[in-house]
């Protein structure tokens, strides 16, 4: 109508998807009677009647709003439930009397997108790519209106940069009317980006104001050529023979190049390639002194066939040679003296110690052991230990046996053995002396002899217990060039009352045991012969 004032801006009503919008008809009493109002929705400039108010009573018109509209506030407010993005439009109320006026409401609909889902390029990014590559994608699902995306690297927003950074965003409309935003970050990365943290942020608005959601932080696999190659040895510190040693080749490129490890040959002055495991690690197990030498690593880029060489690394496997003792098999008369000398070579300074074998008692610190006024008891083992004090566990030993000339010496002079008649008895007798003695028995039986060491012998005799044997006992006699000696074994019948409850079975064993190394005892075992019938 000419001269009519411009339409005022519609009232803004903001609401979240799924909630209820309250559309209050803002007509004053002078502009129209609120008991007689028509409500319209305006879409693409087309008005559609959606609701009528007559005498304060509401009536929905058939159509998309039929089930979702109701009157509130004594007819002044139209309530629209279950708001969807499609409801974002202008609604107007029109009073009928005294003259037709209308009031417009702009409904704005909002929905927060879901948490952004960030995906990293699963193949990684080479630094030498000619163009920006797809680094990561960010997807924000089911937001309304379309959220804004910002990409961050190490906490700083990324800006478009020609030929360096390109952000490509697109959106799709779901059947619900909500938007799914996909943003692709394309960039040319550099080696330093291997540790960079990327994330995306979705900015969106709700009736309550501006909000944002952040994705998780991700790192991107970055591929870059090797510039430096080096060797690492494990364990660190001083190495010794017997250790498990790993020589590992390392490079600063990603992916790691193909490695080969070589060792300088001192005689030919040429490097010889060593056999590494699948990971390019040379394992020396056990390490030997021959493994000492100069090692180098060569790294190959299989694409370019360019190779890089590491700084050489000197490897020293510390060792102690076999220990030599002189004299190697000493023999001495009682009362004489003896000097034992120990020698060994090592890659480090050595310490020597002499120990008595039987007691582990330290006799001397140094390579020479002097023994004077030798007694028979001085016979036996002496151990020289050559060790490197600066490398725990690096030592070698050599045992030498000293023989003192003398007649046989019995482990025991006499002893009692408990027996039962008709048992097979296992008797033992031990003697020592130099020269090594032989042992004989005064009764018939099966005898067997075994060397305990060069000066000591153990004889065992299997014999049937008879009344005569119980009468006489058993003697063993040891003899050598320098004399003879005898031990007596007295046989005593077992009193049945001394037997334990479970030892009266037909297969029971009764054993009397003592260490053959102690000078007072020996071992005897009796075994009952199988009987023709068992006793109940």
């Amino acid at each position: 109508v000419p001269g009519e004032a411009e339409q005022p801006a519609p009232e803004l009503v903001e609401v979240e998807v799924g909630s209820t919008a309250l559309l209050k008809c803002g007509l004053s009493q002078s502009q129209g009677n609120l008991s007689h109002v028509d409500w319209f929705s305006v879409h693409k400039e087309k008005r559609t009647l959606i609701f009528r108010v007559r005498q304060g009573q509401g009536q929905s018109e058939p159509g998309e709003y039929e089930q979702r509209l109701s009157l509130q506030d004594r007819g002044a407010t139209l309530a629209l439930t279950q708001v969807t993005p499609q409801d974002e439009r202008i609604f107007l109320c029109q009073g009928k009397r005294p003259r037709s006026q209308e009031y417009r409401i702009q409904l704005r609909v909002y929905k927060a997108p879901e948490e952004p889902n960030i995906q990293v390029n699963p193949l990684g990014i080479p630094v030498n790519s000619k163009e920006p590559e797809e680094v990561a994608t960010c997807v924000g699902r089911n937001g309304y209106p379309i959220p804004q995306v910002i990409w961050y690297k190490n906490g700083r927003p990324l800006k478009e940069e020609k030929n360096r950074v390109h952000i490509q965003s697109s959106q799709t409309v779901e059947s619900s009317g909500l938007y799914t935003l996909q943003s692709i970050l394309k960039a040319q990365l550099v080696k330093e980006d291997k540790d960079a943290q990327f994330y995306c942020e979705l900015n969106y608005r709700l009736p309550s104001g501006n909000h944002m959601k952040e994705s998780r932080e991700v790192t991107v696999p970055v591929f870059y050529p090797t510039e430096k190659v080096w060797l690492e040895v494990e364990p660190v510190g001083m190495l010794k023979e017997g250790d498990r040693v790993e020589i590992r080749c390392l490079a600063d490129g990603n992916p790691p190049p193909h490695f080969s490890i070589s060792k300088g040959n001192p005689s030919t002055r040429e490097a010889e390639e060593e056999t590494t495991n699948d990971n390019g690690v040379l394992v020396l197990e056990p390490a030997r002194k021959e493994h000492s030498g100069r090692y180098e690593c060569q790294a190959w880029n299989l694409d370019t066939m360019i190779s890089l060489l590491s700084e050489p690394q000197e490897l020293l496997v510390n060792y102690v040679s076999d220990v030599r003792v002189s004299p190697a098999a000493p023999e001495r008369q009682e009362g004489s003296s003896l000097t034992l000398t120990c020698e060994a070579e090592s890659s480090q300074d050595l310490e020597f110690q002499w120990l008595r074998e039987e007691t582990d008692q330290v006799l001397e610190r140094g390579p020479v052991l002097q023994l004077h006024d030798l007694k028979r008891e001085a016979g036996g083992g002496y151990r020289c230990v050559a060790s490197v004090p600066s490398i725990p566990g690096l030592n070698r030993t050599q045992l030498v046996k000293l023989a003192i000339f003398g007649p046989p010496w019995m482990a025991f002079k006499e002893r009692k053995v408990w027996v039962k008649e008709n048992m097979v008895l296992n008797l033992s007798c031990e003697a020592s002396g130099h020269p090594r003695p032989t042992i004989s028995w005064n009764v018939n039986g099966t005898a067997s002899e075994g060397d305990q060491d060069p000066q000591r012998v153990l004889s065992t005799l299997n014999v049937l217990v008879t009344p005569e044997l119980l009468e006489t006992g058993v003697e063993c006699t040891a003899s050598n060039d320098l004399g003879k000696n005898t031990s007596i074994l007295f046989l005593e019948l077992v009193n049945l009352t001394t037997l334990t409850p479970d030892s009266n079975t037909t297969t029971g064993l009764s054993t009397s045991t003592a260490s053959p190394h102690t000078r007072a005892n020996s071992t005897s075992t009796e075994r009952k012969l199988p009987e023709p019938e068992s006793r109940g």
Epitope: I125, S129, K130, P221
Partner: antibody, heavy 116, light 106 residues
Framework: QVTLKESGPVLVKPTETLTLTCTVS????????VSWVRQPPGKALEWIAA???????YYNSAFKSRLTISRDTSKSQVVLTMTNMDPVDTATYYC??????????WGQGTLVTVSS | DIQMTQSPSSLSASVGDRVTITCKGS??????LAWFQQKPGKVPKLLIY???SLQTGIPSRFSGSGSGTDFTLTISSLQPEDVATYYC????????FGGGTKVEIK
């Protein structure tokens, strides 16, 4: 619409080199990466190699020394060569488009038999 | 390399049944998982990407769920045309496929 079509020999002899071509339409090789995937008869799918929209190449480490992937953007073609073929390489070979990291369109596949 | 283990390797169900296929990753792959359908003698067809997003044109009876290492493909009401082998694929680090699940009608 988006299409991918594989072409190449159906039969190769052991130790020979296989060359397969994937011709694409409906998108640009400078916008999307393309992968090669194979499937031996009655078995599962196995990724072989890819070339990115920027031209970077990637290979399955199991075959890396035998593979080369390249592209000719003017012809909209991606080429895969696989050396030293073996009867175990008998499979249907597919090319597939990345969108951007998953495979949304596949070629119809070409069955390659390795036999003497 | 990331391994993807699918179970079961095969199943038989009646038309209208709800069918569930699982896929387990050897490490956390977040939501970098796709599901493909391959009918006998045909090309693999993308059903689901980003673990739970339905590819355009795929019937809504297909749905995907899961995150991290455990994922599920569900067919809410099995149809005769769903007879196929289904593969999961991770794209978190490189590309690896599951061994496949063959779905048949009883």
């Amino acid at each position: 619409q988006v299409t991918l079509k594989e072409s190449g020999p159906v039969l190769v002899k052991p130790t020979e080199t296989l060359t397969l071509t994937c011709t694409v339409s409906g998108f640009s090789l400078t916008s999307n990466a393309v992968s090669w995937v194979r499937q031996p008869p009655g078995k599962a799918l196995e990724w072989i190699a890819a070339i990115s929209s920027g031209g970077s190449t990637y290979y399955n480490s199991a075959f890396k020394s035998r593979l080369t992937i390249s592209r000719d953007t003017s012809k909209s073609q991606v080429v895969l060569t696989m050396t030293n073929m073996d009867p175990v390489d008998t499979a249907t070979y597919y090319c597939a488009r990345h969108r951007p990291f998953y495979f949304d369109y596949w070629g119809q596949g070409t069955l390659v038999t390795v036999s003497s | 390399d990331i391994q993807m283990t699918q179970s079961p390797s095969s199943l038989s169900a009646s038309v209208g049944d709800r069918v569930t296929i699982t896929c387990k990753g050897s490490q956390n792959i977040y939501k970098s998982l796709a599901w493909f359908q391959q009918k006998p003698g045909k090309v693999p067809k993308l059903l689901i990407y980003d673990a739970n997003s339905l590819q355009t044109g795929i019937p809504s009876r297909f749905s995907g769920s899961g995150s991290g290492t455990d994922f599920t493909l569900t067919i809410s009401s099995l149809q005769p045309e769903d007879v196929a082998t289904y593969y999961c694929q991770q794209y978190y680090s490189g590309y690896t496929f599951g061994g496949g699940t063959k779905v048949e009608i009883k």
